[in-house]
């Protein structure tokens, strides 16, 4: 039995898989900030987690996925307002009793030091200094990400 949030994540992922392959993104769109090989968009409005997930999808992006502690710190360094929280693409899977990224992978327990409970209807937010478990229905800001396509040098044969 999947929760409505899990269903929403799966539906969005499946619809994305059905779409035709788009050309790679070489530069970040206007208003998006580049962080290494990603483009990030920090929202200025607030939403519950599932609405934030859907908003990123409409922007042909996803809620932020964080690979490791280093990427977390670099992302947090972009947050100017110390009192603001942002949703990322991580929520509690009741069926698997574990934190699950929206791409289907599970959280490596060493990556994020989460403050708060791991329980049903809990989603993850980040601030400039911390990572919090929060009710998914809470209306806060969110971060969308787009992957940048690495530019490869073309090798031409000698003519």
């Amino acid at each position: 039995q999947k929760s409505s949030i899990e269903k929403c994540s799966v539906d969005i992922q499946q619809s994305r898989n059905k779409t035709t392959e788009r050309p790679g993104l070489l530069n970040c769109p206007i208003y998006w900030q580049q962080l290494r090989e990603k483009c990030l968009l920090f929202s200025h409005t607030v939403n519950p987690w599932n609405n934030s997930l859907a908003d990123c999808s409409t922007k042909e992006s996803s809620l932020l996925l964080i690979r490791d502690k280093d990427e977390l710190i670099h992302t947090q360094n972009l947050i100017r307002d110390k009192a603001i929280l942002f949703w990322i693409g991580l929520n509690f899977s009741l069926s698997e009793k574990n934190w699950k990224w929206i791409n289907g992978s599970f959280l490596n327990s060493n990556d994020l030091e989460i403050r708060g409970d791991a329980k049903e209807n809990s989603c993850i937010s980040i601030s400039q200094t911390s990572v919090y478990s929060e009710y998914c229905s809470t209306e806060i800001r969110w971060i969308c990400q787009k992957e940048l396509t690495p530019v490869r040098n073309k090798v031409y044969p000698d003519s």
Epitope: K82, I84, L85
Partner: antibody, heavy 119, light 110 residues
């Protein structure tokens, strides 16, 4: 155990500068996410935020009092100092310092110090 | 004039449930900032009662609960007791990078 204590003059003359010190123990102002703020409360009135200083030396001030306020920290002494210039009788209040902790909340408060402005 | 608006007073009989509202705007509560609640007993310093909209610090009875929706927040006190008679303040942040308080609500236990 976390404690904060305010100290400074109890009586100040109009136009003088008030200097208050918050001495704290049980936490460090060099810890990421931590801050110390000042809040005042005139007799029988509401709480009014004055200033806030963070672990990284970021400072926030009340917009209405910004030109008169200065907040500084001495991490090694576990102290935060607030100065308020050009004191007026309307500045008569109990002045509190408080620690900014989890979720940006003032989780621990000092007992407060009453400051009277009178000639 | 406080940035956050609270009713000046509320009252209830012992055992009753009372709520205190805190209304802000799109630049503070509605901008996603947390709301915190403080209890100030007569002649004492304020004490943190609810942080992060709904969380209770250790030692605070579960009779106290907080919630937030849109540009408003509320504090509920169930099973009212005589010792709950106090002033209650809400607090949040503003996008102008300042801390904002409510004007306070005096709770009287009848």
């Amino acid at each position: 155990q976390i404690t904060l204590k305010e100290s400074g003059p109890t009586l100040v003359k109009p136009t003088q500068t008030l200097t208050l010190t918050c001495t704290f123990s049980g936490f460090s102002l060099s810890t990421s996410g931590v801050g110390v703020g000042w809040i005042r409360q005139p007799p029988e009135k509401a709480l009014e935020w004055l200033a806030l200083i963070y672990w990284d030396d970021d400072k926030l001030y009340s917009p209405s009092l910004k030109s008169r306020l200065t907040i500084t920290k001495d991490t090694s002494k576990n102290q935060v100092v607030l100065t308020l210039t050009n004191m007026d009788p309307v500045d008569t209040a109990t002045y509190y310092c408080a620690r900014l902790g989890m979720r940006h909340a003032f989780d621990i408060w000092g007992q407060g110090t009453m400051v009277t402005v009178s000639s | 004039q406080s940035v956050l608006t609270q009713p000046p007073s509320v009252s209830g009989a012992p055992g009753q449930r009372v709520t205190i509202s805190c209304t802000g705007s799109s630049s503070n509560i509605g901008a996603g900032y947390d709301v915190h609640w403080f209890q100030q007993l007569p002649g004492t310093a304020p004490k943190l009662l609810i942080y992060g909209n709904r969380y209770r610090p250790s030692g605070v009875p579960d009779r106290f609960s907080g919630s937030k929706s849109g540009t408003s927040a509320s504090l509920a006190i169930a099973g009212l007791q005589a010792e709950d008679e106090a002033d209650y303040y809400c607090q949040s942040y503003d996008s102008s990078l300042s801390v904002v308080f409510g004007g306070g609500t005096k709770l009287t236990v009848l």
